[in-house]
Interface confidence: medium
C-alpha cells in the first residue's frame, strides 16, 4: 500500500471519487468542476458561499469524468503554496470506503428515508444545513463509523441536489466535505493510523503482509 | 425511541454501564472542533444526546483533532456535466436509500434577506417548523438538522461498534487458527508505523 507519511492522503481525491461513485449508483455522471481545497493545515481560501443557482447540468462527454479530473490535484489556497505534499490515494482506500458506505446505507436505509423527509434543500439553505449537521455529528467526538456517516450524508445531499435539479450544489458540497476533512478530521485521522487504519478495520479481514 | 437502560444523554462503557464525565473513555472526548460557521469558543461539554442515541459499545478510535480556526468556504465557479444513465438505475443492489419527496422542477427561492417572504415562502417556512416540531420524541423547537445529525451520530456509533467487534473477532479467530499469520500481521503494523515515522 502507498505510504502516506505524516501528511496523509489527498482528502479531495477521496471525496471526489466517493461522490462520483454515489452519483453513478443513481445513474448520474459527474464531471467535477474546480472544487479546489486547501491542503490540511493551510489557510482557507477567501470568499463566501455562493450557490450559483443559475448553473444547469449539460450532457456529459463519453469520457470517464473521474479520469478527466485526475490526478485530482489539490490547488493550494492563497498563502499555502508551500503546503505539504499529499500522497496519491491507493485504490484500496476508495474501494473500502465505497464498501463501507454501501454497507452503511443498506443497514440504515430506513433511518435515511426517515431523515430525508426532514432535509429540505434549497441553494440558499444547503450550506447552513450541511454545516449544522456535520457540526452536531462530530460535536462530542470522532470515530470511523461517524466518518462513514459523514460521507454518506454528503453523498445523500449530492444525490438529492441532482434529483431536485440543483446539480450546481454538488461541487459546493464536495468542497465543504473536503474542507471539513482537512480542517477538522485530518488530525484525528492521522493520529489514528490514517486511512490505512480505516482499510485495516473496514476492509477485507485478511490481506498479505504488504499490499 | 424505546428507552435505553441508561439515560439517552449518558455515555456508556462496553457493558452499557453509565460513565461519569471523569471516567469518559479517552477515545471520545467532548468538544470536537467542528464549527463551520463560527470561531471556536472553547470546548463545551457535549452530550451524547438525541432522540436516537443509545449506548453503542464500540468505542471510537483515538483522540480528537486540536481546534482549527474555521474560515468561510471558498466557492469557485462550478462546472457540471451530468448524464442520466438509465441502465445504471437497476444496477445497484446495495439498497441505497432514496429520497421520495416530490421532485420539484425548480428550487423555491426563499431568501431570508427579504423583509417580507412571499406567501409560498411563508408556507414553506411554516412547513419546515411544523416538521421540526412534529416529532414527539424531541423538544418542539429542535431543528430538523439537529435531529438528522443526532440520528447520524447514533447510527455512526452503532456501525463503528459493529466493525470494532468484527476486527476483534477476526484477530481472535486468526490467533487460534493461524498464529504465524497473526505474527505477520503484527509485523506489518510495526513496519507501517516505523515507515510513517520517517
Amino acid at each position: 500500500m502507498a505510504h502516506a507519511g505524516r501528511t496523509g492522503y489527498d482528502n479531495r481525491e477521496i471525496v471526489m471519487k466517493y461522490i462520483h461513485y454515489k452519483l453513478s449508483q443513481r445513474g448520474y455522471e459527474w464531471d467535477a468542476g474546480d472544487v479546489g481545497a486547501a491542503p490540511p493545515g493551510a489557510a482557507p481560501a477567501p470568499g463566501i458561499f455562493s450557490s450559483q443557482p443559475g448553473h444547469t447540468p449539460h450532457p456529459a462527454a463519453s469520457r470517464d469524468p473521474v479520469a478527466r479530473t485526475s490526478p485530482l490535484q489539490t490547488p493550494a489556497a492563497p498563502g499555502a503554496a508551500a503546503g505539504p505534499a499529499l500522497s496519491p490515494v491507493p485504490p484500496v482506500v476508495h474501494l473500502t470506503l465505497r464498501q463501507a458506505g454501501d454497507d452503511f446505507s443498506r443497514r440504515y436505509r430506513r433511518d435515511f428515508a426517515e431523515m430525508s423527509s426532514q432535509l429540505h434543500l434549497t441553494p440558499f439553505t444547503a450550506r447552513g444545513r450541511f454545516a449544522t449537521v456535520v457540526e452536531e455529528l462530530f460535536r462530542d467526538g470522532v470515530n470511523w463509523g461517524r466518518i462513514v456517516a459523514f460521507f454518506e450524508f454528503g453523498g445523500v445531499m449530492c444525490v438529492e441536489s441532482v434529483n431536485r435539479e440543483m446539480s450546481p450544489l454538488v461541487d459546493n458540497i464536495a468542497l465543504w466535505m473536503t474542507e471539513y476533512l482537512n480542517r477538522h478530521l485530518h488530525t484525528w485521522i492521522q493520529d489514528n493510523g490514517g486511512w490505512d487504519a480505516f482499510v485495516e478495520l473496514y476492509g477485507p479481514s485478511m490481506r498479505p503482509l504488504f499490499d | 425511541m424505546a428507552k435505553q437502560p441508561s439515560d439517552v444523554s449518558s455515555e456508556c462503557d462496553r457493558e452499557g454501564r453509565q460513565l461519569q464525565p471523569a471516567e469518559r473513555p479517552p477515545q471520545l472526548r467532548p468538544g470536537a472542533p467542528t464549527s463551520l460557521q463560527t470561531e471556536p469558543q472553547g470546548n463545551p461539554e457535549g452530550n451524547h444526546g438525541g432522540e436516537g442515541d443509545s449506548c453503542p459499545h464500540g468505542s471510537p478510535q483515538g483522540p480528537l483533532a486540536p481546534p482549527a480556526s474555521p474560515g468561510p468556504f471558498a466557492t469557485r465557479s462550478p462546472l457540471f456535466i451530468f448524464m442520466r444513465r438509465s441502465s445504471l438505475l437497476s444496477r445497484s443492489s446495495s439498497g441505497y436509500f432514496s429520497f421520495d419527496t416530490d421532485r420539484s422542477p425548480a428550487p423555491m427561492s426563499c431568501d431570508k434577506s427579504t423583509q417580507t417572504p412571499s406567501p409560498p415562502c411563508q408556507a414553506f417556512n411554516h412547513y419546515l417548523s411544523a416538521m421540526a416540531s412534529m416529532r414527539q420524541a424531541e423538544p418542539a423547537d429542535m431543528r430538523p438538522e439537529i435531529w438528522i445529525a443526532q440520528e447520524l451520530r447514533r447510527i455512526g456509533d452503532e456501525f463503528n461498534a459493529y466493525y470494532a467487534r468484527r476486527v476483534f473477532l477476526n484477530n481472535y479467530q486468526a490467533a487460534e487458527d493461524h498464529p504465524r499469520m497473526v505474527i505477520l500481521r503484527l509485523l506489518r503494523y510495526i513496519v507501517r508505523l516505523v515507515w510513517r515515522m520517517h
Epitope: Q25, R26, R106, R107, R109, R110, D111, A113, E114 | M1, A2, Q4, C12, G16, S54, C55, P56, H57, G58, L89, S90, S92, S93, S94, G95, Y96, F97, S98, D100, R154, I155, D157, E158, A161, Y162, R165
Partner: antibody
C-alpha cells in the same frame, strides 16, 4: 437450524413491569438485528422496535417510547424487551423476529402471550 | 407514518380457485436507488407466528409454493394465490419495509367455502 424461543405466557398485574425474553440459537446472534412486534386480537401487527445485538443500539416506534426498553445479553444469545407501567392495553402476543439482511423478517419466535390483569 | 390499507378484509373461496388481494400504501415504497419496492407479504395461520412469503414486492421466499405471486410497484400491490389449497387458509399481511416505523396492513383473512 435457526430458532427463537419465547416463553408461552406471562401474567402480570396492572402498573407492574415485565421482561420478555427471546433466546436465539442456530446462528450467530450478533450478526442479525432483532425486532419485536405486538399483536392484539383483531388489531393486526404493530412494530415495536429493533436492537442491534452487537452494539446494543436500538431504533423504536415512537409510540412505544415510554413503554418498551430493548436489551440483549450476548453471552446467552438472548434478546429482552421490558414493558413498564402495564395496562390492559398491553395485553397482547409479543413476537421477536430476526431481520434478514436488513430487509425482512425471516424467522419469528412463537410469541409470548402477555396478560395484564388484577 | 406510512399507512398500509388492505382489501378486502376477508375472502371466501373454493379450493382450486385463483384469488387476489390488494395492499395500498400511503406513500411510495419504491427505492429509486435500486428499483426495489420495499413491501413484504406474510402469512399467519391461527396460533402461529407470521411466516415470510414475499419480499421486495415480488420475490418469493425459498420454500414458498409458486402459486403465491406478488406484484405491483410504488403504492399499489397485489398478492395472488392461484389454485388455492386448504392449507392456504390464513390471514395475509402486507408490510411497509421502506421507512420507519415499519407498519403492517390490517390483514386479509382467507376462508374456505
Amino acid at each position: 437450524q435457526v430458532q427463537l424461543q419465547q416463553p408461552g405466557a406471562e401474567l402480570v398485574k396492572p402498573g407492574a413491569s415485565v421482561k420478555l425474553s427471546c433466546k436465539a440459537s442456530g446462528y450467530t446472534f450478533t450478526s442479525y438485528w432483532m425486532h419485536w412486534v405486538k399483536q392484539r386480537p383483531g388489531r393486526g401487527l404493530e412494530w415495536i422496535g429493533r436492537i442491534d445485538p452487537n452494539s446494543g443500539g436500538t431504533k423504536s416506534n415512537e409510540k412505544f417510547n415510554n413503554k418498551a426498553t430493548l436489551t440483549v445479553d450476548k453471552s446467552s444469545s438472548t434478546a429482552y424487551m421490558q414493558l413498564s407501567s402495564l395496562t390492559s392495553e398491553d395485553s397482547a402476543v409479543y413476537y421477536c423476529a430476526r431481520w434478514w439482511d436488513y430487509d425482512y423478517f425471516d424467522y419469528w419466535g412463537q410469541g409470548t402471550t402477555l396478560t395484564v390483569s388484577s | 407514518d406510512i399507512v398500509m390499507t388492505q382489501s378486502p378484509s376477508s375472502l371466501t373461496v373454493t379450493a382450486g380457485e385463483k384469488v387476489t388481494m390488494s395492499c395500498k400504501s400511503s406513500q411510495s415504497l419504491l427505492n429509486s436507488g435500486n428499483q426495489k419496492n420495499y413491501l413484504t407479504w406474510y402469512q399467519q395461520k391461527p396460533g402461529q407466528p407470521p411466516k415470510l412469503l414475499i419480499y421486495w414486492a415480488s420475490t418469493r421466499e425459498s420454500g414458498v409454493p409458486d402459486r403465491f405471486t406478488g406484484s405491483g410497484s410504488g403504492t399499489d400491490f397485489t398478492l395472488t394465490i392461484s389454485n388455492v389449497q386448504a392449507e392456504d387458509l390464513a390471514v395475509y399481511y402486507c408490510q411497509n419495509d421502506y421507512n420507519y416505523p415499519l407498519t403492517f396492513g390490517a390483514g386479509t383473512k382467507l376462508e374456505l367455502k
